[in-house]
Interface confidence: medium
């Protein structure tokens, strides 16, 4: 049946799905927070640009009796039951805000008229790219994958004089959401990462990632895996390590790494993490007080989700245009708007660039040191500390398989 | 002693293509990121893209990205501009520049050729 | 893109002035500590030559006389005593978000 969109005459609404399962385990209330602080931030650009219109949200709620599994693996049949309570009330806002689990997104996304915008925190698997009307506004799985390969493959800069062709994945299935999917698509034997590598294996058991550390006979020097320092060192604990291993741990939205007291424990040495540039104001904020520093960006992904919209909002009342249309919904790509937090990107799919910063541990000060960065918006590699203090020899980056010389 | 010499500049009609060269010399080619810049007749420094030619990664400025394409030969040393669909606007003389990165990690345009004219008119 | 603003646009001065030029970025150019800023010197007909790079640091060759300062959005290029040769166009460019140029100052004989 036909959905009315409450999305005219000076009256907006945001259709704010509140689901059980969500990609991080974030309370409802710091998302609803998250969203009316948006909120009142439109409210204001729209009055200060003399558009005198009304914005609100309708936050959905979906059945928690059914779907109270907390994570994102019934999130399909849940993403489903909203779309039919949203059917059923005849009434959907100019645009949906959630889903974040990648089944829920992509199911919704097939089974429903997209002739309104869907603004995702999350929905990171490689089956939610390239999607006309979809915004991921949190690193998806694809940006990982290119940062990964320009970097396998950057052999001009003195730290890092090898080209890599080579890779074990770590991935024993109990991986946060967005650890899922991004080591989902690195496993992907169609993937742009494993198309790039000569030889790549997922290790899936911890004694296979154990034994590895210290295998003569092992096939590459370098691992991957995602998650936080405490995920590694329940893996590895105290473990010798061959000299020439690197591990590249991805643990993109987490902020700790950044703080001024923070040190590096001694098994992180032979670890490179990537993570994500951190925000500037969001430490201080009165909605992100009360979150940890992994929660910080998907809370924060909800509030741009908001200022996303109010944007557009701004510019097709500006030029006179329709709200309900098509080509509103298809415009949530490729431009800047202003977040909360600073300008945010979005590339010609509609999906969030960042700067991915590369940390290592510095042996000197066993702090963790910014080595470069790397802006997804150009897929490039940007050096930030060309003499680092590395555990490995001569301080540079070893070659990915034990015993070859210089390519 | 490192060089950039391009080539290929000349008169062109609106509509038509031109293909300009760069020949680099004296430094590593591969490891260098190689940029196009532009300058029309009195006017300022407009930059159009980059090439590393390791891997053939390229950045082209929105405003040419429908009309210009960056290329290498690594073999010769050499970047190319393919420019289609020549306007007015285009005239410009055309520069051939590389980016040095710092051992300090500051990246900059440290050597320029003498650039290349290119006239766009019926 | 970063926008840069320079000013003045156009300058005539006399041989042994003290000449500043001003660049002005639209958001920071700075980066882990530093400022992706250059400064060019170009003469009619001439490529474009590096004079200062990452806001304050001499490129090689250059020669003393001039220096640049700033940080963030707000940049200087300071000549202390023009030389007949100092003639020329100056360009501020940015490196920190792809590339920009500012419109250029033309420094002209009095």
């Known amino acids: 049946s036909q959905v009315s969109q409450n999305c005219h005459n000076g009256s907006y609404e945001i259709s704010v799905l509140m689901m059980g399962n969500s990609a991080f385990a974030e309370p409802l209330k710091n998302l609803e927070d998250a969203v009316n602080e948006g909120l009142e931030i439109v409210r204001g650009r729209l009055q200060n640009a003399g558009l005198n219109v009304t914005v609100n949200a309708t936050f959905m709620y979906s059945d928690g009796l059914i779907h109270n599994s907390g994570d994102c693996r019934s999130s399909t049949c849940e993403g489903l039951d909203l779309l039919r309570k949203i059917s059923n009330a005849q009434r959907m806002g100019c645009v949906l805000i959630g889903p974040s689990c990648t089944y829920s997104t992509f199911q919704m996304y097939l089974d429903t008229e997209l002739s309104y915008p869907m603004i995702s925190a999350g929905s990171f698997g490689l089956s939610c790219d390239y999607k006309e009307t979809l915004t991921r506004l949190m690193s998806p799985a694809r940006k990982l994958m290119y940062f990964l390969v320009n970097f396998w493959k950057t052999n001009d800069l003195p730290f890092k004089t090898y080209s890599w062709s080579t890779s074990y994945v770590y991935k024993n299935g109990t991986e946060t959401e967005d650890c899922f999917w991004y080591l989902n698509a690195l496993e992907a034997s169609v993937s742009y990462f494993s198309h790039e590598l000569g030889f790549k294996v997922v290790l899936r058991q911890d004694k296979e990632f154990q034994d590895i550390l210290m295998d003569h006979n092992r096939k590459s020097n370098v691992i991957i895996m995602c998650g936080g320092p405490e995920f590694l060192y329940k893996l590895k604990g105290d473990r010798a390590v061959a000299e020439d291993i690197v591990i590249i741990l991805v643990d993109l939205f987490n902020d700790q790494y950044f703080e001024d007291n923070v040190t590096a424990p001694d098994y992180m040495k032979n670890v490179l993490v990537l993570t994500l540039s951190p925000g500037n104001s969001l430490l201080n904020s009165s909605f992100s007080r009360n979150l940890s520093p992994t929660k910080r960006d998907f809370a924060l992904a909800y509030l741009n989700g908001i200022l996303l919209f109010g944007h557009m909002l701004k510019i097709f009342l500006e030029n006179g245009e329709n709200i309900t249309t098509p080509k509103f919904a298809h415009a949530f790509r490729n431009l800047t708007f202003e977040g909360y937090d600073g300008p945010v990107t979005l590339d010609d799919w509609g999906d969030v660039d960042s700067t991915m910063v590369l940390l290592y541990t510095s042996v000197d000060t066993k702090k963790y040191k910014v080595l470069l960065t790397y802006d997804t918006h150009v897929n490039k590699t940007y050096p930030v500390d060309m003499s680092p203090t590395f555990t490995w020899k001569n301080s540079k980056l070893p070659n990915d398989i034990t015993g070859r010389g210089p390519q | 002693e490192v060089q950039l010499v391009e080539s290929g500049g000349g008169l062109v009609q609106p509509g038509g293509s031109l293909r300009l060269s760069c020949a680099a010399s004296?430094?590593?080619?591969?490891?260098?990121?190689m940029h196009w810049v532009r300058q029309a007749p009195g006017k300022g420094l407009e930059w159009i893209g980059e090439?590393?030619?390791?891997?053939?990664?390229?950045n082209v400025h929105e405003k040419f990205k429908d009309r210009f394409t960056i290329s290498v030969d690594k073999a010769k040393n050499s970047a190319y501009l393919q420019m289609n669909s020549l306007r007015a606007e285009d005239t410009a003389v055309y520069y051939c520049?590389?980016?040095?990165?710092?051992?300090?990690?500051?990246?900059?345009?440290?050597?320029w050729g003498q650039g290349t004219l290119v006239t766009v008119s019926s | 893109d970063i926008q840069l603003t320079q000013s003045p646009s156009s300058l005539s001065a006399s041989v042994g002035d003290r000449v500043t030029i001003t660049c002005r970025a639209s958001?920071?150019?700075?980066?882990?500590?530093?400022?992706?800023l250059q400064w060019y010197q170009q003469k009619p007909g001439k490529a474009p030559k590096l004079l200062i790079y990452?806001?304050?640091k001499l490129a090689s060759g250059v020669p003393s006389r001039f220096s640049g300062s700033g940080s963030g959005t707000d940049f200087t290029l300071t000549i202390s005593s023009l030389q007949p040769e100092d003639f020329a166009t100056y360009y501020c460019?940015?490196?920190?978000?792809?590339?920009?140029f500012g419109q250029g100052t033309k420094l002209e004989i009095k």
């Open positions: 520049t590389r980016t040095i990165i710092t051992t300090e990690g500051y990246w900059f345009f440290d050597v």
């Open positions: 004296g430094f590593t080619f591969s490891s260098y990121w």
């Open positions: 090439i590393k030619p390791s891997n053939e990664l390229t």
């Open positions: 958001e920071s150019v700075d980066y882990y500590g530093s400022s992706l």
């Open positions: 990452a806001a304050s």
């Open positions: 460019q940015q490196t920190r978000k792809a590339y920009t």
